[in-house]
């Protein structure tokens, strides 16, 4: 007989999940020298503990605590680039600067990144069918719980000057939804963070407006000064030239506004 | 049929090293774990340690770090358990086990199990 | 490391009697337990797995129960081929441990 099975609105977890995370784990620690200690079979134990058996719909922070202990990561406090929207030019530029950091860029988001993950209650199966839906379905599932934990924690971390790519080309260039409105931003640290910058970045080549002026950032800027730390912004009008240029600083057409 | 056949027993002196072999037919051995799990005579179970062959990666209890090696051969479907430094205390019947890489199951397949003495 | 402790270590019953062996975890382990049964100069074999389901081809008067850190193995009516010893496994964490057995002996 069948069993019956929750059907979510969102995909199902992604295909071959376990053996992705492990061999992401296993890559990530051979690149990085001071995560050569992890045991990637045990994070691995410690990320399935966290939402399989459990009801898809009811994952906490908590659950995710046994992973988070062994993903501890040291990163400069001062190195830190947030982004909303924007991904992959955020991870563009940590390609390049080096010395710089995204969430993904850490053990635990590098593991999790672009992938969908959920089990069903009282078995221990993996539902590759399908997993709840943040609107849809319910908020606390175990792919949302995730990325709300390792951002709070992210940006518990920072300190001094932290930057933000932010997507000029949306009608909501800071959005209070996103995980930078509703976690990063409540979680910088007053008294460590001296600084929030955001960049934004420009989707039209021809599009020379002042995004720093627009509504929603004038709104970060408020939510940010009511909690004591300073706001900055700058437009980045020529996102390939910037990108360009952080490759090649001595480059002759780099001393231009980009 | 799964089947996990291992190497014949072994006589080893003190301070020497044993290898044993654990060669698994009937199944897709890329999508397996192999355990390592000894019991000394008359005495309960105690796990060694793990490898997956997919991705080439091994871990160990504490007790054994530093004296035993478990690897694994894609080619010939074999997994291997290398223990250095034996002393008389390391006599025992020593077993591959079988679980998936996710480690979401049991031990489901078993081998037939190498008695390994250690004497002088 | 997490400790799992069985008991009784050894019981005497009859065939047909009801057998129920208990295994505790020093710390929370969900549901990952599985039991074993082995008899002399045999490998274990595995019986139980998430702490309640029933392996494949292993006979109904075998059940599990618990969570957390108490856990059970009950065999219904114990038949004569059932004579042997029994441990549970934690697969929660590395490194993985054993309870030190549970050898079941005709009365």
């Known amino acids: 007989v069948p069993r019956w099975r929750q059907q979510w609105s969102g995909p199902g977890t992604t295909k071959r999940f376990p053996e992705t995370v492990l061999a992401r784990c296993v890559k990530y620690t051979e690149i990085h020298p001071e995560m050569r200690h992890v045991d990637c079979q045990s994070v691995w134990d410690a990320f399935k503990g966290a939402f399989i058996s459990k009801h898809p719909c009811n994952i906490t922070e908590e659950d995710y605590q046994p992973l988070m202990k062994l993903g501890t990561q040291t990163v400069p406090c001062n190195k830190i680039l947030l982004w909303s929207r924007i991904k992959d030019l955020a991870h563009q530029f940590t390609q390049v600067q080096r010395d710089m950091f995204t969430l993904e860029d850490t053990l635990l988001g590098y593991l999790a990144d672009d992938l969908t993950w959920c089990g069903e209650f009282n078995t221990s199966k993996i539902n590759y069918q399908s997993c709840p839906d943040w609107r849809k379905d319910c908020s606390n599932n175990p792919v949302s719980v995730f990325w709300k934990t390792v951002s709070r924690r992210f940006a518990e971390a920072a300190c001094d000057v932290v930057h933000v790519m932010l997507n000029g080309s949306r009608s909501k260039i800071f959005d209070k939804n996103s995980t930078f409105g509703s976690v990063e931003v409540h979680n910088l640290q007053p008294e460590k963070v001296q600084t929030l910058e955001a960049w934004v970045i420009h989707g039209g080549r021809e599009d020379s407006r002042d995004l720093c002026q627009d509504p929603t950032i004038k709104e970060l800027e408020s939510i940010i000064s009511k909690r004591n730390i300073q706001f900055s912004c700058k437009n980045i009008y020529r996102p390939d030239k910037f990108l360009q240029c952080v490759k090649n600083p001595e480059d002759s057409s780099c001393t231009s506004e980009i | 049929q799964v089947q996990l056949v291992q190497s014949g027993a072994e006589v080893k002196k003190p301070g020497s090293s044993v290898k044993v072999s654990c060669k698994a037919s009937g199944g897709t051995f890329s999508s397996y774990a192999f355990s390592w799990v000894r019991q000394a005579p008359g005495q309960g179970l105690e796990w060694m340690g793990r490898?997956?062959?997919?991705?080439?990666?091994?871990n160990s209890a504490q007790k054994f770090q530093g004296r035993v090696t478990i690897t694994a051969d894609k080619s010939t479907s074999t997994a291997y358990m290398e223990l250095s430094s034996l002393r008389s205390e390391d006599t025992a019947v020593y077993y591959c086990?079988?679980?998936?890489?996710?480690?979401?199951?049991?031990?489901?397949?078993w081998g037939q199990g190498t008695l390994v003495t250690v004497s002088s | 490391d997490i400790q799992m402790t069985q008991s009784p270590s050894s019981l005497s019953a009859s065939v047909g009697d009801r057998v129920t062996i208990t295994c505790r975890a020093s710390?929370?382990?969900?549901?990952?337990l599985a039991w074993y049964q082995q008899k002399p100069e045999k490998a274990p074999k595995s019986l139980i797995y998430?702490?309640?389901s029933l392996q494949s081809g292993v006979p109904s008067r075998f059940s599990g129960s618990g969570s957390g850190t108490d856990f059970t193995l009950t065999i219904s009516s114990l038949q004569p081929e059932d004579f042997a010893t029994y441990y549970c496994?934690?697969?929660?964490?590395?490194?993985?441990?054993f309870g030190q057995g549970t050898k079941v002996e005709i009365k």
């Open positions: 710390q929370g382990i969900s549901s990952w």
């Open positions: 998430a702490a309640s």
């Open positions: 490898v997956i062959p997919q991705l080439g990666i091994a």
């Open positions: 086990a079988r679980d998936d890489i996710a480690a979401l199951g049991p031990f489901d397949y």
């Open positions: 496994q934690q697969y929660n964490s590395y490194p993985r441990t």
